[in-house]
Amino acid sequence: GSERTCCPVNWVEHERSCYWFSRSGKAWADADNYCRLEDAHLVVVTSWEEQKFVQHHIGPVNTWMGLHDQNGPWKWVDGTDYETGFKNWRPEQPDDWYGHGLGGGEDCAHFTDDGRWNDDVCQRPYRWVCETELDKASQEPPLL
């Protein structure tokens, strides 16, 4: 059939990507799996413009993104280069803080209440955002 050019139902289109915003919280790994089960990935922020778009939709709520350093260096889940890419950390973050008493440091990144990023314990049940590129999302009919 002809290629569709719209996002699945309940997803929001923006700049050739589709975004889905959760209403509940999950640990980072479950949020990651949730997005993968939707043939998507946790949101990868590549520009200030995309940062503002996501921030507008999530509001002042801790929300996971697709950035982690569970295996050493910081990595985006889709392979986007971290070192040369967009960053929006809070001052003095990431700090891999061990003082939370939950064991280990902080290996997963999230949007904070002001939109800037913080690293936190990956087991915390935060909301999350899934993202998929529009050409991938349109390979199948939208969810009905």
Epitope: N10, S22, S24, D30, R36, L37, D39, K136, E140, L144
Partner: antibody, heavy 123, light 107 residues
Framework: EVQLLESGGGLVQPGGSLRLSCAAS????????MNWVRQAPGKGLEWVSA????????FYADSVKGRFTISRDNSKNTLYLQMNSLRAEDTAVYYC????????????????WGQGTTVTVSS | DIQMTQSPSSLSASVGDRVTITCRTS??????LGWYQQKPGKAPKRLIF???SLQSGVPSRFSGSGSGTEFTLTVSSLQPEDFATYYC?????????FGGGTKVEIK
Amino acid sequence: EVQLLESGGGLVQPGGSLRLSCAASGFTFNNYAMNWVRQAPGKGLEWVSAISRRGGSTFYADSVKGRFTISRDNSKNTLYLQMNSLRAEDTAVYYCAKGELLEDYYYFAMDVWGQGTTVTVSS
Amino acid sequence: DIQMTQSPSSLSASVGDRVTITCRTSQDIRNDLGWYQQKPGKAPKRLIFAASSLQSGVPSRFSGSGSGTEFTLTVSSLQPEDFATYYCLQHNSYPPTFGGGTKVEIK
């Protein structure tokens, strides 16, 4: 009516391979994630594997990781489970189970199940 | 993985009895839990989703309750066709996990 029909089970020697199929009808197959769940004789249910609706992501129980491969052909409305390096403990009835449209509450949920196909691993 | 503790593992009851089965989880799963009925040689059939919502076509004598870590399936008045094995499934956290099952037998 939603229907799932498994096939491909049988008797196989340890170390051997089998490919299970699950033919789906009565719903828009490519809108749903799909799962395989197994049940050893006289035992409970064990989730085995899942696949996203377009097949881009796959998930496996630790007990089968590296030996089993889940796949799907949306043009044929069919789900597959390729089982390699089979062991005696893989002996079970294998069910395919339909996922649900994903909202927060339906992560890895399963609503409709097929009747199952029996896999026996024995020498 | 989330551990599912289902109890009792078996029970004997008579037609007309009220039967209660419990599923406890090792961590909070909100209400992301389903209940299934399985008869010998048959596929599991979902009775309850989202902990307390009745699946379409399932008799109203079945009900589910609970949230967090403790969940209950109740059959208000057991019928002959209800003698079967019942399982809970949590789908809040990966991997999805089932309870060990409860076999409901005729007394």
